[in-house]
């Protein structure tokens, strides 16, 4: 009996530009002799329904139809026909099929590959054209994929140390697609510093499918109106 097992759940998620290993494990009743078996990996794009051959291994020869694609002969000996794809790109997402032949038996399995890109976040202060005591804080998120993203603003005061979501005076612009297929978006928070307590901490909170935990950038309102002290990769202002 010959069986193939792919990633549990049928979906694998990988970061953009990563060296991804798409799992495919072989279960066979006898020890595997790699010189008398064949492995073929196929890919079907999300945008068109045509299946393309990515990699082929048979006997004493292997061929990559996608540069760098490889199945390890050393791992194949112990039943691992996983496909390594270095530098995975957004357009390589889709359905991957692992087909194993141990003559006369054949088995196959499929998995969906999702490619994600994590946003970089930074805070900017824009005072151009603003009224007295009014500031506009911009939270820029860039280089993320897929497009769906959630940006919120929170504040913590000395009176209320638990974060409170701010809903007023928040404008989140449209997402902009970059040349590389990733997206950018900017969310703005308008503040009237005269009406806010010094020491209040404001946070821009970014949630995205690529992030295990939200990306947080913060600034503290001081008597001198503002002090950006961000915890993430951001621009700093004093």
């Amino acid at each position: 009996d010959l069986k193939v097992e792919m990633m549990a759940g049928g979906t694998q998620i990988t970061p953009l530009n990563d060296n991804v290993t798409i799992f495919c494990n072989i279960f066979y009743s006898q020890p595997l002799n790699i010189t008398s078996m064949g492995i073929t990996w196929f890919w079907k794009s999300l945008t068109f329904d045509k299946e393309v051959k990515v990699f082929e291994f048979f006997g004493d020869h292997q061929e990559a139809f996608r540069p760098g694609a490889i199945v390890s002969p050393w791992r194949l000996k112990s039943g691992d026909a996983s496909l390594r794809l270095p530098g995975i790109q957004l357009e390589e997402a889709g359905e991957y099929r692992c087909e194993v032949v141990v003559t006369p038996l054949k088995a196959q399995g499929t998995v969906q590959l999702e490619v994600v890109a994590s946003p970089a976040s930074r805070l900017l202060l824009d005072q151009v054209g603003m009224k007295e005591n009014e500031d506009k804080y911009m939270c820029e998120s860039s280089g993320f994929y897929p497009e769906a993203i959630n940006i919120t603003w929170e504040k913590q005061t000395q009176k209320f140390p638990h974060p409170i979501e701010i809903s007023e005076d928040v404008i989140t612009g449209p997402t902009i697609k970059n040349m590389d297929g990733t997206f950018n978006v900017t969310s703005c928070l308008k503040l009237n510093s005269s009406q806010e307590d010094p020491g209040t901490v404001y946070q821009c909170v970014v949630r995205h499918a690529s992030l295990h935990t939200p990306l947080r950038s913060n600034f503290t309102l001081t008597a001198a109106r503002h002090s950006l002290s961000e915890t993430e990769k951001t621009d700093n202002f004093s």
């Epitope: 799992f23 004493d60 490889i70």
Partner: antibody, heavy 120, light 111 residues
Framework: EVQLVQSGAEVKKPGASVKVSCKAS????????MDWVRQAPGQGLEWIGD????????LYNQKFRGRVTLTVDTSISTAYMELSRLRSDDTAVYYC?????????????WGQGTTVTVSS | DIVLTQTPLSLSVTPGQPASISCKAS??????????MNWYLQKPGQPPQLLIY???TLHSGVPDRFSGSGSGTDFTLKISRVEAEDVGVYYC?????????FGQGTKLEIK
């Protein structure tokens, strides 16, 4: 920085078993196999076997088959080598080594070695 | 099993002079156009360290005075100018077939 840190020296009696651990850090544990190699005093290198942390698949040197068991715990990036029914000629330094398996097959980083002494 | 025979088993070299070690395999270690022969150096009291893989590719951080060549059954490790830090035992290893096997080692000393 890639590091393989092995457990300490062991002294065992003939017929006993020994389990050596190898804690990996500085790389993605499942991207490489783990080789085990031993070296008897004043002798050369001898390949025991390897394990694929991806699926737990093992390949053993026939010489050790039935006496050696290779395992991994991916949650703590640690590989283990257990050798049973020890004999005096199993006295050796046992090494774990990270093994590239996609673009060739070679051991590019080695543990510091674990000395196993089998003596009655 | 594939048997690897190294020659010489020991050599004594003056610093700055070249050195060469041969490794002969009992059968070809080539597969699909590549040679699965690796070279390691074991310095006294240390674990082995990788020098060369796939017969001729220098491992990162290894000085370029080391070079490897060969295919099929005949392989050579060369050191263009031996330095004091090169002392130790050199091993060839084939990884084409299991069990992966090592040569018996070549001990390099400085004159």
């Amino acid at each position: 920085e890639v590091q393989l840190v092995q457990s300490g020296a062991e002294v065992k009696k003939p017929g006993a078993s020994v389990k050596v651990s190898c804690k990996a850090s500085g790389y993605t544990f499942t991207d490489y196999n783990m080789d085990w190699v031993r070296q008897a005093p004043g002798q050369g290198l001898e390949w025991i076997g390897d394990i694929n942390p991806n699926n737990g698949g093992t390949l053993y040197n026939q010489k050790f088959r039935g006496r050696v068991t290779l395992t991994v715990d991916t949650s703590i990036s640690t590989a283990y080598m257990e050798l049973s029914r020890l004999r005096s000629d199993d006295t050796a330094v046992y090494y774990c080594a990270r093994s590239e398996v996609f673009y060739g097959n070679y051991a590019d980083y080695w543990g510091q070695g674990t000395t196993v002494t089998v003596s009655s | 099993d594939i048997v690897l025979t190294q020659t010489p088993l020991s050599l004594s070299v003056t610093p700055g002079q070249p050195a060469s070690i041969s490794c002969k395999a009992s059968q070809s270690v080539d597969y699909d156009g590549d040679s699965y022969m690796n070279w390691y150096l074991q310095k006294p009291g240390q674990p082995p360290q990788l020098l060369i893989y796939a017969a001729s590719t220098l491992h990162s951080g290894v000085p370029d005075r080391f070079s490897g060549s060969g295919s099929g059954t005949d392989f050579t490790l060369k050191i263009s100018r031996v330095e004091a830090e090169d002392v130790g035992v050199y091993y060839c290893q084939q990884s084409k077939e299991d069990p992966r096997t090592f040569g018996q080692g070549t001990k390099l000393e400085i004159k």
